[in-house]
């Protein structure tokens, strides 16, 4: 697994560098997670033809993956920092069950899948420190998550492969949209 942000060789080589600001740390954390997703997607795409499949829509209907929309305040038109930050944190919390599903779905990248999951938890903590209105953040219900996880794991092999591909693709897009919005804050 890649080295977490703040522990790379560049940081060791440059001890006199200014400490990272909160925004820079968040930016770096997202980029680190995106690297992990990229590695996981490589394994998924090498293992199956899901990345070229045109049957994505069939499987996508069964998943309720978080997605950015204009109403969330993260787009340029109608940009609202607090609303957007709440959407990002809520979305990441909703993704956690899907990231749990990804564990044990990878052979050669098992560590990487764990790193993505753990780094996402750290990112959520960073963002919660930044948010003023923590009350507006709804945490997913653990019972609902547990039954969703059971349902996903009970799918046939093809659907499990497709689900893995869709989770990685959607999570990547959500993080990129978040990265874009956070740079405006």
């Amino acid at each position: 697994a890649p080295v977490p942000p703040g522990e790379d060789s560049k940081d060791v080589a440059a001890p006199h560098r200014q400490p990272l600001t909160s925004s820079e740390r968040i930016d770096k954390q997202i980029r680190y997670i995106l690297d992990g997703i990229s590695a996981l997607r490589k394994e998924t795409c090498n293992k199956s033809n899901m990345c070229e499949s045109s049957k994505e829509a069939l499987a996508e209907n069964n998943l309720n993956l978080p997605k950015m929309a204009e109403k969330d305040g993260c787009f340029q038109s109608g940009f609202n920092e607090e609303t957007c930050l709440v959407k990002i944190i809520t979305g990441l919390l909703e993704f956690e069950v899907y990231l749990e599903y990804l564990q044990n779905r990878f052979e050669s990248s098992e560590e990487q899948a764990r790193a993505v999951q753990m780094s996402t938890k750290v990112l959520i903590q960073f963002l919660q420190k930044k948010a003023k209105n923590l009350d507006a953040i709804t945490t997913p219900d653990p019972t609902t998550n547990a039954s969703l996880l059971t349902k996903l794991q009970a799918q046939n092999q093809w659907l499990q492969d497709m689900t893995t591909h869709l989770i990685l693709r959607s999570f990547k897009e959500f993080l990129q949209s978040s990265l874009r919005a956070l740079r405006q804050m």
Partner: antibody, heavy 119, light 107 residues
Framework: QVTLKESGPTLVKPTQTLTLTCIFS??????????VGWIRQPPGKALEWLAL???????RYSPSLKNRLTITRDTSKNQVVLTMTNMDPVDTATYYC??????????????WGQGTLVT | DIVMTQSPATLSVTPGDRVSLSCRAS??????LHWYQQKSHESPRLLIK???QSISGIPSRFSGSGSGSDFTLSINSVEPEDVGVYYC?????????FGAGTKLELK
């Protein structure tokens, strides 16, 4: 392979609206991390970024020209359109469209059209 | 807006020279810095992205370095075809901004 091509009028009268079209191939807006932008270059001068549109239809504009610019896209036709209102002789320039694509949204413009000169 | 300042404005070189082009940002832009080459009557071409990442098809004599707000593009042995204008670009925050360019010419 990736290609972009700009088209539009070569001559525009003052106060008129300029409409430029960028037709591209070799990539699509279905891929997250993709954006297409417009950049202009007055004769003998430096590059100036104008506007950009993302894979999910979010947009960014140059603050100094924001009130005059509109960027839209047609994903089915693989094209991006830029309109610029209230044209003035100082808007004389070569207008380029260019693509940016990377996971981190670094906005490095890796492919450019040939440009279209608007006077 | 982040202002990108390039120096020198013009650089006269002899083929085989090693040259350095400077670019300074008015505030820290981390590693969101890209270099372009524009030859006469041509579109700009991406040379280096994210300070030092090489681009497929670009000769290895081009390299980039720097961090924060000070950046350098180096050409380790100038070829006659390297003549043109070199621009740096801020990719950190909007509006995206370019430097005024450094013109590379032969003596």
């Amino acid at each position: 392979q990736v290609t972009l091509k700009e088209s539009g009028p070569t001559l525009v009268k003052p106060t008129q609206t300029l409409t430029l079209t960028c037709i591209f191939s070799g990539f699509s807006f279905k891929t997250s991390g993709v954006s297409v932008g417009w950049i202009r270059q007055p004769p003998g001068k430096a590059l100036e970024w104008l506007a950009l549109i993302y894979w999910d239809d979010d947009k960014r504009y140059s603050p100094s020209l924001k009130n005059r610019l509109t960027i839209t896209r047609d994903t089915s036709k693989n094209q991006v359109v830029l309109t610029m209102t209230n044209m003035d002789p100082v808007d004389t320039a070569t207008y380029y469209c260019a693509r940016s694509y990377d996971d981190y949204l670094y906005y490095a413009l890796d492919y450019w059209g040939q440009g279209t000169l608007v006077t | 807006d982040i202002v990108m300042t390039q120096s020198p404005a013009t650089l006269s070189v002899t083929p085989g020279d090693r040259v350095s082009l400077s670019c300074r940002a008015s505030q820290s832009i981390s590693d969101y810095l890209h270099w372009y080459q524009q030859k006469s009557h041509e579109s700009p071409r991406l040379l280096i992205k994210s300070v030092s990442q090489s681009i497929s098809g670009i000769p290895s004599r081009f390299s980039g370095s720097g961090s924060g707000s000070d950046f350098t593009l180096s050409i380790n042995s100038v070829e006659p075809e390297d003549v043109g204008v070199y621009y740096c670009q801020n990719g950190h925050s909007f509006p995206l901004t370019f430097g005024a360019g450094t013109k590379l010419e032969l003596k």
